[in-house]
Interface confidence: low
């Protein structure tokens, strides 16, 4: 199905406008901001979601990176250029002609420049590290229960193939979820790890993108898992290119 037929809504993206004007009167949904048709049987790309959310307040994060080539989304929200498939265009610019290159999750991977800046290809983010800190609980969660619950969540809620959840690490109160997906591993129809991570990030913040579903109620053996801090690191297949000035 492309969208819920009964009331013509998009189960996987509430930031859409839907109407029964598809072939044969089928429900068709278009993303706000871009007007692009979306497939409501799967996650909408992060680029189209950011475009729909362009007027939302800025969200910046600045904690220490876990490796020299990991990227953190310090720039927050911007109105991105998306290609006809809904992916980020390799080069993004703001309305005052400041341009930069991004990776496949839309995070800046070069210094900022002007219109003469070239971004020859969209570099794939193949490794995402989601770093969570949970609120204090009576005791630590059982690691294998936590692992199983988070894998189930990514499989069922975000439709991410289990093979892309590389590992779940736990050292109370820190949980780390590793998502890995090389270009060669991603088959047609596979959810992108960047899109799954973005949906998860929004769920954790209580800003679910799903239509009509309640917020994320994460429980491990019945015990609520409440996240008080999230930090996401992105590792690209080709290391980012920042000047030494930025790195110091």
């Amino acid at each position: 199905h492309t969208a819920a037929q009964d009331n013509c809504t998009c189960p996987t993206n509430k930031m859409t406008v839907c109407s029964p004007d598809g072939p044969g009167g089928r429900c068709q949904c278009r993303a706000l901001g871009s007007g692009m048709a979306v497939d409501c049987s799967t996650l909408t790309s992060k680029c189209l979601l950011l475009k729909a959310r362009m007027s939302a307040p800025k969200n910046a994060r600045t904690l220490v990176r876990p490796s020299e080539h990991a990227l953190v989304d310090n720039d927050g929200l911007y109105d991105p250029d998306c290609d006809p498939e809904g992916r980020f265009k390799a080069r993004q610019c703001n309305q005052t002609s400041v341009c930069w290159c991004v990776n496949s999750v839309g995070v800046r991977r070069t210094d900022k420049g002007d219109l003469s800046l070239r971004c020859d290809e969209l570099v794939r983010t193949h490794h995402i590290l989601i770093d969570l800190r949970h609120r204090p609980t009576a005791g630590a969660f059982n690691h294998s229960d936590l692992d199983a619950e988070l894998r189930r969540l990514f499989r069922e809620r975000y439709r991410l193939h289990p093979k892309f959840v590389a590992a779940v690490h736990y050292e109370q109160p820190t949980i780390q979820i590793e998502l890995r997906q090389n270009t060669s591993q991603k088959a047609a129809g596979d959810v992108d790890i960047g899109d799954a991570a973005y949906y998860f990030e929004r769920d954790i913040k209580g800003e679910s993108l799903f239509q009509g579903r309640g917020g994320l109620d994460l429980r491990v053996r019945g015990e609520p898992l409440q996240v008080e801090r999230t930090l996401i690191y992105y590792l690209d297949e080709i290391p980012p290119k920042f000047s030494m000035k930025r790195l110091t």
């Epitope: 109105d79 250029d81 290609d83 006809p84 265009k89 390799a90 080069r91 993004q92 610019c93 703001n94 309305q95 005052t96 002609s97 341009c99 002007d114 219109l115 003469s116 800046l117 070239r118 020859d120």
Partner: antibody, heavy 121, light 107 residues
Framework: QVQLVQSGAEVKKPGASVKVSCKAS????????MQWVRQAPGQGLEWMGW????????KYAEDFKGRVTISADTSTSTAYLQLSSLKSEDTAVYYC??????????????WGQGTLVTVSS | DIQMTQSPSSLSASVGDRVTITCKAS??????VAWYQQKPGKAPKLLIY???YRYTGVPSRFSGSGSGTDFTLTISSLQPEDFAVYYC?????????FGQGTKLEIK
């Protein structure tokens, strides 16, 4: 509606300078870039440079660096192109054109009527 | 600099014909290509931007397609007012560059 009105035709001697103006109306001047393009008689279009009217910063094509100055007066919504050390090959129609600022907006949606500059001794 | 090569440089056609003009970029310019129409003694007019988007007020008989290095402007059914010179332009990177033009004449 959006309009760009350019100054009148000019005849100049080799080595002289010319300054062409382009007055914008129908939109907020500082929300769009102003580009300059020229067209020699019977020839194609050649981009000369532009000014970011928001920041006031110009950028020039390599072939014109050192000879061209692009400026803007936001109080009168007017952009200017000054070309110095004129040569006979600079005889052309000079156009101003409005563009956007962001990465996908560097096409020219509104053009001035053009100003013919003739360089002749 | 990115070279934009148009073909053909001139072409003769009749009212009602379907006409295609192509533009080849010397490097990948994504979908950042615009098409303009220019009539004698007049400024160019924007027809298509970002390869396939028709500008406001441009008749639906004009369409554009392509990405990367190869782009096409198609006029589905020529009208008398369509005889003019057509230019492509890459709006991906400075210096902004134009094709040399295609003169569309009445057969």
């Amino acid at each position: 509606q959006v309009q760009l009105v350019q100054s009148g035709a000019e005849v100049k001697k080799p080595g002289a300078s010319v300054k062409v103006s382009c007055k914008a109306s129908g939109y907020t001047f500082t929300t769009a870039g102003m580009q300059w393009v020229r067209q020699a008689p019977g020839q194609g279009l050649e981009w000369m440079g532009w000014i970011n009217t928001h920041s006031g910063v110009p950028k020039y094509a390599e072939d014109f660096k050192g000879r061209v100055t692009i400026s803007a007066d936001t109080s009168t919504s007017t952009a200017y192109l000054q070309l110095s050390s004129l040569k006979s090959e600079d005889t052309a129609v000079y156009y101003c054109a409005r563009s956007g600022f962001g990465s996908s907006y560097w096409y020219f949606h509104v053009w001035g009527q053009g100003t013919l500059v003739t360089v002749s001794s | 600099d990115i070279q934009m090569t148009q073909s053909p440089s001139s072409l003769s056609a009749s009212v009602g014909d379907r006409v295609t003009i192509t533009c080849k970029a010397s490097q990948d310019v994504s979908t950042a290509v615009a098409w303009y129409q220019q009539k004698p003694g007049k400024a160019p007019k924007l027809l298509i931007y970002s390869a396939s988007y028709r500008y406001t007020g441009v008749p639906s008989r004009f369409s554009g397609s392509g990405s990367g290095t190869d782009f096409t402007l198609t006029i589905s059914s020529l009208q008398p007012e369509d005889f003019a010179v057509y230019y492509c332009q890459q709006h991906y990177i400075t210096p902004l560059t134009f094709g040399q033009g295609t003169k569309l004449e009445i057969k």
